[in-house]
């Protein structure tokens, strides 16, 4: 708390300008009117206030707006945003994408702080869904943003927003998240032709079911091993050797290097050794010739 002291003669601020950077904390408190500060917030970010001075300015705004700042002030907070707590931000009602962009710009290059996470949460909840423009903005500033959302939150992402997603935005997504995103991506890209479709859908394939992988294997897509290794194990297991060969194309040779890792390891265990041998890669661990394979899950389903 800054003590209440009278403003020295001639020091009363008539506008927010560079002369204020030389005011001591108590002078700022005493000589800067909170209403003046609020109407001239756009100037604050253009003046190099010290960290302590910014604390005083924040205190003045808090006193003026105990229920939360109006958007006209929030929009121009600039570096003062970094002084806000999540509790402060929960009082805000941010509706403008421009306001969101302005505040994210201030935090650019930093990790996503609790303040930013709260700001985004307030903004998205206010909008009701994660629309394309918002998603575009958020992933531009925080490539990992999408993967920080729960599957429930991701379900509110409209398929049209998927166009904004870049491959690196999905790097940290887990299978549960991709399960939600994949059907949306499939819907979003459904009108594209084969090769273009594959380029777009590739990053989402960690959520693809077996039947879609089988369909892709008929389209000469030449999936790389990195993508294959991210596929759902349960989706890969039913694929035949011929289907995997078609799916991977020239990349099929990479299976040898990955034969001890999932999903390749588990897939090998489900294939006939005879079939694996046709690949000529020396993959071992398949079902020996002459053995009968019983699909117990199918049997249970029939009974």
């Amino acid at each position: 708390e800054v003590e209440k002291t009278a403003c020295p003669s001639g020091k009363k601020a008539r506008e927010i300008d560079e002369s204020l950077i030389f005011y001591k904390k108590w002078e700022l408190e005493a000589c800067v009117d909170a209403a003046l500060l609020a109407t001239q917030m756009d100037r604050v970010n253009a003046i190099p206030f010290t960290y302590e001075q910014l604390d005083v300015l924040k205190h003045k705004l808090d006193e003026l707006y105990p229920q939360g700042y109006p958007e006209s002030v929030i929009q121009h907070l600039g570096y003062l945003f970094l002084k806000m707590s999540p509790e402060d931000i929960r009082k805000w009602n941010v509706t403008s994408l421009e306001t969101l962009k302005a505040l994210l710009e201030v935090n650019k290059g930093h990790e996503m702080s609790p303040q930013v996470a709260t700001l985004i949460d307030r903004f998205v909840k206010g909008r009701g869904q994660l629309d394309k423009d918002t998603l575009d903005t958020l992933t531009a500033f925080y490539p990992g943003y999408l993967c920080s959302l729960s599957p429930e939150e991701l379900s509110s992402v409209p398929p049209s927003s998927i166009w904004a997603v870049r491959p690196q935005d999905l790097d940290t997504c887990d299978p549960r998240q991709l399960d939600v995103l994949y059907p949306k991506a499939r819907l979003a890209f459904q009108n594209m032709n084969g090769s273009e479709y594959f380029v777009k859908i590739q990053s989402f394939l960690g959520g693809a079911p077996t039947e879609d992988l089988k369909a892709l294997s008929q389209q000469n897509v030449s999936m790389d091993l990195a993508t294959f290794m991210k596929l759902r194990t349960d989706a890969v297991l039913p694929l035949t050797v011929a289907e995997v060969q078609k799916l991977l194309g020239p990349h099929v040779e990479g299976l040898k290097a990955e034969e001890r890792h999932r999903p390749v390891r588990d897939w090998i265990l489900r294939q006939r050794q005879d079939d694996l041998d046709t690949l000529g890669l020396g993959l071992q661990g398949g079902i020996p010739n002459g053995y009968l394979v019983l699909d117990l899950s199918m049997q249970e389903a029939l009974s």
């Epitope: 560079e18 002369s19 950077i21 030389f22 005011y23 970010n45 253009a46 003046i47 190099p48 206030f49 010290t50 960290y51 302590e52 570096y79 970094l82 290059g109 930093h110």
Partner: antibody, heavy 121, light 109 residues
């Protein structure tokens, strides 16, 4: 072009005083805050003091507070540093520097040539 | 008090190589309050970078600044003979008002 020409350095005994000057030209001196920065022999840079464009506000590093006084005469386009009660640890090259704050990213965009102050008995 | 720690203390490289100089702050600082200076023997410092990444007037584009929070970097691509000097990072806004790193000496290998 912008120029900051310094004078007033020299050898002085501990406890004595010295006044440094920095004559500015090539810009509107009265529109800029000015600083003094020093550098002990073979050492790094150390900020000393700042004065606002109109001379009404001053800040000092703790190491010189109460002993050094920064001032300016805008009619003469000159910055001063009055150094009293000098100590051996004040031995350094002293630089005056113009402070560019208009971009909100404060930086010293022009420096004087430096003047050596040696405090020795 | 915000302390700036520069590393390495000395960097030995040849002309044409790339120099990467680090400046670490003891606590998170605003990017717009972080600058870099070059000082050659017997000369005053010269402003290179302000706002962590903005080149000052007349500074060649082989100099670039980056970073945020506590970690900042000055990169000099394709070193020229005149680039061998001492480099200081500087921060404004704390107490004391202005602090400098201890400097990195860039010398010819």
């Amino acid at each position: 072009q912008v120029q900051l020409v310094q004078s007033g350095g020299g050898v002085v005994q501990p406890g004595r005083s010295l006044r440094l000057s920095c004559a500015a030209s090539g810009f509107t001196f009265s529109s800029y805050a000015m600083h003094w920065v020093r550098q002990a022999p073979g050492k790094g840079l150390e900020w000393v003091a700042v004065i606002s464009y109109d001379g009404s506000n001053k800040y000092y590093a703790d190491s010189v507070k109460g002993r050094f006084t920064i001032s300016r005469d805008n009619s003469k386009n000159t910055l001063y540093l009055q150094m009293n009660s000098l100590r051996a640890e004040d031995t350094a090259v002293y630089y005056c520097a113009r402070w560019k704050v208009s971009s909100s990213s404060p930086a010293f965009d022009y420096w004087g040539q430096g003047t050596l102050v040696t405090v020795s008995s | 008090e915000i302390v700036l720690t520069q590393s390495p203390a000395t960097l030995s490289l040849s002309p044409g190589e790339r120099a990467i100089l680090s400046c670490r702050a003891s606590q998170s600082v605003y990017t717009k309050y972080l600058g870099w200076y070059q000082q050659k023997p017997g000369q005053a410092p010269r402003l290179l970078i302000y706002d962590a990444s903005t080149r000052a007037t007349g500074i060649p584009d082989r100099f670039s600044g980056s970073g945020s929070g506590t970690d900042f970097t000055l990169t000099i691509n394709r070193l020229e003979p005149e680039d061998f000097a001492v480099y200081y990072c500087q921060h404004y806004g704390g107490s004391p008002l202005i602090t400098f790193g201890q400097g990195t000496r860039l010398e010819i290998k």
